[in-house]
């Protein structure tokens, strides 16, 4: 089951996922002047079994002027160093990201990828928030949101984070003391949000699902 709508927006804060649950989809988007190759995939899909998850399909971009020339899918390590990281990429990924069962890591960049990533999240996905540069966390509740299924509808929990305009930034999990457990958080939403969205994916793993979208922008 995929999530409806976007995770909540918090003023002066951005969010990202540390790992992606199986079923998550990522648009294959190319930067300006490049286009997805005609035979190329529209989306990458996080799939897997009990022991291993990975991204199916490959995103490939080609120059808009040269329609038949495909670009390599995954840059070499040197090229990856040159590429800008996602908007909230921490210097060190949390240790448990790679070993989290049923989750995929952040997909590697592909050459001439667009400057934003568009994700379609599944129920159970957690995203983490931090204040943007120049703001600091004033209220330190759990700074995450989880996509939950309630009364047959999906909803995102409300992160307990307020960002105030002082020159200090909060960090992602793994870069500071752990915050309160999500289970212990007060839920700000009590009603069932009617926010459903069709999602049809033709794979062995899914038939008709529901979806949400997340756009991250690189700095």
């Amino acid at each position: 089951e995929l999530c409806d709508d976007d995770p909540p927006e918090i003023p002066h804060a951005t969010f990202k996922a540390m790992a992606y649950k199986e079923g998550t989809m990522l648009n294959c988007e190319c930067k300006r002047g490049f286009r997805r190759i005609k035979s190329g995939s529209l989306y990458m899909l996080c799939t897997g079994n009990s022991s291993h998850s990975s991204w199916d399909n490959q995103c490939q971009c080609t120059s808009s002027a040269t329609r038949n020339t495909t670009k390599q899918v995954t840059p070499q390590p040197e090229e990856q160093k040159e590429r800008k990281t996602t908007e909230m990429q921490s210097p060190m990924q949390p240790v448990d990201q790679a070993s989290l069962p049923g989750h995929c890591r952040e997909p590697p960049p592909w050459e001439n990828e667009a400057t934003e990533r568009i994700y379609h999240f599944v129920v159970g996905q957690m995203v983490y928030y931090q204040c943007v540069q120049g703001y600091r966390a004033l209220h330190r509740g759990p700074a995450e949101s989880v996509c939950k299924m309630t009364h047959g509808k999906t909803r995102w929990t409300q992160p307990q984070l307020i960002c105030t305009g002082e020159m200090e930034t909060s960090q992602f999990p793994g870069e500071e003391k752990p915050q309160a457990s999500p289970e212990g958080r007060p839920e700000s939403e009590t009603s069932c949000l009617v926010t459903t969205t069709d999602f049809q994916i033709q794979t062995e793993m899914a038939a008709t699902m529901e979806t949400s979208i997340f756009t991250t922008e690189y700095q």
């Epitope: 976007d6 033709q202 979208i213």
Partner: nanobody, 126 residues
Framework: QVQLVESGGGLVQAGGSLRLSCAAS????????MAWFRQAPGKEREFVAA????????RYASSVKGRFTISRDNAGNTGFLQMNSLRPEDTAVYYC???????????????????WGRGTQVTVSS
């Protein structure tokens, strides 16, 4: 010259139905994602629905889910938006849009769409 032309708008009573059409020329719908947006007076443009040509993803705004259905006739290069159980708050100008990539929806989703129609007015009276 790419053109998207919407039709099918009009005045309808609350609870009624309308079927919007979007005829495309200059592009083939069988390799473009098609979407519908709307803009009510004094409000920002709002995502309504989108569907890619492979039918991998079909996406609706939560406010129209269960009432509106997006469909497409790739052979006829036409897209449709079936609107049932219309409400006064559905009153807006409805725009058809297309892009080469996958579905983009949600709050700032209009920018990635490459081609736009001029819109058709839908008015729902109470």
């Amino acid at each position: 010259q790419v053109q998207l032309v919407e039709s099918g708008g009009g005045l309808v009573q609350a609870g009624g139905s309308l079927r919007l059409s979007c005829a495309a020329s200059g592009i083939t719908f069988n390799d473009h994602t098609m979407a519908w947006f709307r803009q009510a007076p004094g409000k920002e443009r709002e995502f309504v629905a989108a569907r890619d040509w492979s039918d991998i993803i079909t996406r609706y705004a939560s406010s129209v889910k269960g009432r509106f259905t997006i469909s497409r006739d790739n052979a006829g290069n036409t897209g449709f938006l079936q609107m049932n159980s219309l409400r006064p708050e559905d009153t807006a100008v409805y725009y058809c849009a297309a892009r080469e990539g996958g579905v983009v929806a949600g709050v700032r989703s209009g920018a990635p769409y490459d081609y736009w129609g001029r819109g058709t007015q839908v008015t729902v009276s109470s």
